[in-house]
């Protein structure tokens, strides 16, 4: 094949080699960019910056080599459009540093930086960590920091990510209240900070205020949906990113629901309880306190991480006719009390049938459902039996 006279020439089915001295000063408009999986660049002393726009359209790129060139700066978001990048060779350029953000989100199997005048500072703590952990082939390169010594020896005691403290209200928060959160950010070289509120949706009206090092957040007219939702403060410096999540507990009265008994391994009377703080529960059977045993007991399902409602069963192990009757679940917290009742018939009384009647072969429970989910005022003298905390 005739030698390729262009600055960049095809290499294999999806590769490109740009090796003609000084032919490039940027990577805009590379031919066939959208299908490239491999890009090799060498001897491009005018190629000094690698920015987001340079690699736009190179979504299939897996191997990028820029060597013996003039690269001085790689933007933190330079590889945003190349998520499949797995090998990155930037050796023998003029890089003094490389941000942790540059490689964040990539699954790099190989990162080559040897032959650059790296300067050891906390901004390279992430690279030192790669060296310590044997990642990306970094240890084999024995990277040196210009004027200082091996990267491995860089002192790092002061190279921490930001420290975050989020202040939440001590006092009880009620539905409709306004809540002020404050995120105090400490640390060296702070760059950016903010709030992540993706879980909040319609739980409150959000107003942000302030900036580094103290960020404010007002949650106005909060609803009970705010419970168990993460409010996250984040901050970044040249070392990395820190996040702290808090939850605001919005008080609301207990509520309860009972459902028709179902036969599973044991019989189950399904229930749902809600409230903040988590209500305590008591069961009544035919109006009297039900003492739980290994045959009749409360069992909770695994709670959902982002909601206060708890689901569970009153489990009955091989109930007989003596267990037929009216089951009431009482739920109470400091803001109110609620109850729900259900009739359950597990088995007919074998001693109450007419000898003339045909003997029944199977039974299905006959339930009548009466639920009063509205909170009622808590009276201290109400007699309660077994107490189960919902946490």
């Amino acid at each position: 094949a005739a030698p390729c006279p262009d600055a960049c020439c095809p290499h294999g089915s999806s590769g490109l080699r740009c090796t003609r001295d000084g032919a490039l000063d940027s990577l805009h408009h590379l031919p066939g960019a959208e299908n490239l999986t491999e890009l090799y660049i060498e001897n491009q002393q005018h190629l000094q910056h690698l920015e987001l726009r340079d690699l736009r359209g190179l979504g299939e790129l897996r191997n990028l080599t820029i060597v013996k060139s003039g690269l001085r700066f790689v933007a933190p978001d330079a590889f945003h459009f190349t998520p499949r990048l797995s090998r990155l060779n930037l050796s023998f350029n003029a890089l003094e540093s490389l941000s942790w953000k540059t490689v964040q989100g990539l699954s790099l199997q190989e990162l080559v930086l040897s032959g650059n005048p790296l300067h050891c500072s906390c901004a390279l703590r992430w690279l030192q960590r790669w060296e310590e952990e044997g990642l990306g082939g970094v240890p084999e390169q024995k990277l040196q920091c210009h004027g200082q010594g091996p990267l491995a020896h860089m002192p790092n005691a002061s190279c921490g990510v930001p420290t975050l403290k989020v202040q939440v209200p001590n006092a009880s928060v009620d539905v409709g209240d306004d809540v002020l959160l404050r995120c105090q950010v400490e640390g060296r070289g702070l760059e950016q900070a903010g709030w992540i509120l993706t879980e909040l949706e319609q739980s409150a009206t959000v107003m942000k205020s302030g900036g580094l090092p103290s960020l404010g957040l007002t949650l106005a007219n909060v609803t009970s949906d705010l419970n168990r939702k993460n409010v996250t403060c984040w901050a970044e410096n040249d070392v990395g990113r820190a996040e702290v999540s808090v939850q605001v507990n919005v008080s609301f009265p207990a509520s309860v629901q009972l459902h028709t008994a179902v036969e599973m391994h044991h019989w189950c009377i399904p229930f749902s309880v809600d409230g903040q703080p988590a209500p305590s529960l008591r069961w009544l059977f035919n109006g009297s306190v039900l003492n739980e045993t290994s045959f009749i007991f409360t069992e909770f399902l695994e709670p959902a991480a982002n909601e206060t409602v708890r689901h569970g069963c009153l489990r009955l192990n091989q109930p007989t006719h003596v267990n037929n009757g009216n089951y009431t679940l009482l739920a109470a917290n400091p803001f109110g009390q609620a109850s729900a009742s259900i009739m359950a018939a597990f088995m007919d009384n074998p001693f109450e049938f007419n000898p003339e009647d045909p003997i029944p072969v199977s039974f299905s429970p006959v339930d009548t459902n009466s639920t009063s989910g509205d909170p009622v005022e808590k009276k201290d003298e109400t007699p309660f039996g077994v107490s189960v905390a919902v946490g």
């Epitope: 003094e96 906390c122 004027g147 200082q148 010594g149 091996p150 002192p155 002061s158 060296r188």
Partner: antibody
Framework: QVQLVQSGAEVKKPGASVKVSCKAS????????MHWVRQAPGQGLEWIGT????????SNNQKFKGRATLTADTSTSTAYMELSSLRSEDTAVYYC????????????WGQGTMVTVSS | DIQMTQSPSSLSASVGDRVTITCSAS?????MYWFQQKPGKAPKPWIY???NLASGVPSRFSGSGSGTDYTLTISSLQPEDFATYYC?????????FGGGTKVEIK
Amino acid sequence: QVQLVQSGAEVKKPGASVKVSCKASGYSFTTYWMHWVRQAPGQGLEWIGTIYPGNSDSSNNQKFKGRATLTADTSTSTAYMELSSLRSEDTAVYYCTRFYYEDWYFDVWGQGTMVTVSS
Amino acid sequence: DIQMTQSPSSLSASVGDRVTITCSASSSVSYMYWFQQKPGKAPKPWIYRTSNLASGVPSRFSGSGSGTDYTLTISSLQPEDFATYYCQQYHSYPPTFGGGTKVEIK
């Protein structure tokens, strides 16, 4: 013990060049970066540049780009700093100093070489 | 380049005094280094990585600070402490020095 011994005082005319030497002993010369710092009379300290004798990799303060040349002779464990196109404001004491990476600081300094630029 | 500002540029103190020298960097640095220099002599490393005393430095000296503000403190000034003290950073390239603080006898 680790020692850096520098060449003697020099008097030069403006426009001339001067080459200051720094002989190292007591440690592995090729594995530590050597730096050069100067101090004008009654003034503070100013960094000139650095060289890694192991591979002669070097870099200079932008202020001295093109005028300061750093070299190293590993056979004699000697580092050199040559400053060309001298002017009167280059009159200063020139120091070599080792960057000790185990504790990450300039731990040993030469005694200094006085360079006077005068017509 | 990171600028290093030392204050005061000179101070007069008596033997036994507590002396504090401050160094402010134009942007955040990881560590601060201090050197002592006496007339006609090369600088001597005095405090490295903010708070570590170099070999032979008396325990009356201490260093502290973080971010942009750092301090060298002499708890009880002795006759041999009269000298000029320089701060230096090597967090950012190139290394830069403060203008010096001359500690003189009152």
